[in-house]
Amino acid sequence: KSPIFGPEEVNSVEGNSVSITCYYGPQYASYRKYWCRQGARGGCITLISSEGYVSSKYAGRANLTNFPENGTFVVNIAQLSQDDSGRYKCGLGINSRGLSFDVSLEV
């Protein structure tokens, strides 16, 4: 099994909320958890993390909750708009270190 796993595709509608669950192995319980958006040039910009960071784009409408006892973390995003459509990653540790899973969100 890969170290992290989640939904490859999430399809929703404008105004809705999504709850994206990412699953990880017990050895990663202490790792930082993050959700980032992939850019056209290959980078991945953190939008929210388990350390408490929330980007201005997500302020007031998103949260990340870690459940180490279940080996999951959940990213909740409310008030979806078409602008939220794109490619994301749920990840463990430091961005770009490979412990991540690609998620496509289509609104």
Partner: nanobody, 127 residues
Framework: EVQVVESGGGLVQAGGSLKLACAAP????????MGWFRQAPGQEREFVAA???????????YYADSVKGRSTISRDNAKNTVYLQMNSLKPEDTAVYYC?????????????????WGQGTQVTVSS
């Protein structure tokens, strides 16, 4: 007893396509995660794909690496049916394909979390 029934399997040449269907008439379908698993001869049963619906227009689709980019899982909640469209089939896709249902939304790859299973449909990909 609640049952799920698979259909659509068959013999297909490598590179071909198949669409499997799974009907679950006895389930409160919309509240279930529906999954597809497969078991090749002499192998353990393995996860293929799963789909959740949150009841408010949001779908979550999960895929195994082995079928990613070649398969699409979908569901029709009005018909209590889930589908698996498989394209670019390979001989190594040959297996019995099983449909399963669960209300336990843990890791969708875990077989033991699925309480309801079908009898399976055979898919054979010839080279």
């Amino acid at each position: 007893e609640v049952q799920v029934v698979e259909s659509g399997g068959g013999l297909v040449q490598a590179g071909g396509s198949l669409k499997l269907a799974c009907a679950a008439p006895g389930l409160t379908f919309s509240s279930y995660r529906m999954g597809w698993f497969r078991q090749a001869p002499g192998q353990e049963r393995e996860f293929v794909a799963a789909i959740d619906w949150n009841g408010r227009g949001t779908y979550y689709r999960y895929y195994a690496d082995s079928v990613k980019g070649r398969s699409t899982i979908s569901r029709d909640n009005a018909k209590n049916t889930v589908y698996l469209q498989m394209n670019s089939l390979k001989p190594e896709d040959t297996a019995v394909y099983y449909c399963a249902a669960t209300t336990v939304l843990t890791d969708p790859r875990v077989l033991n979390e699925y309480a309801t299973w079908g009898q399976g449909t055979q898919v054979t990909v010839s080279s």
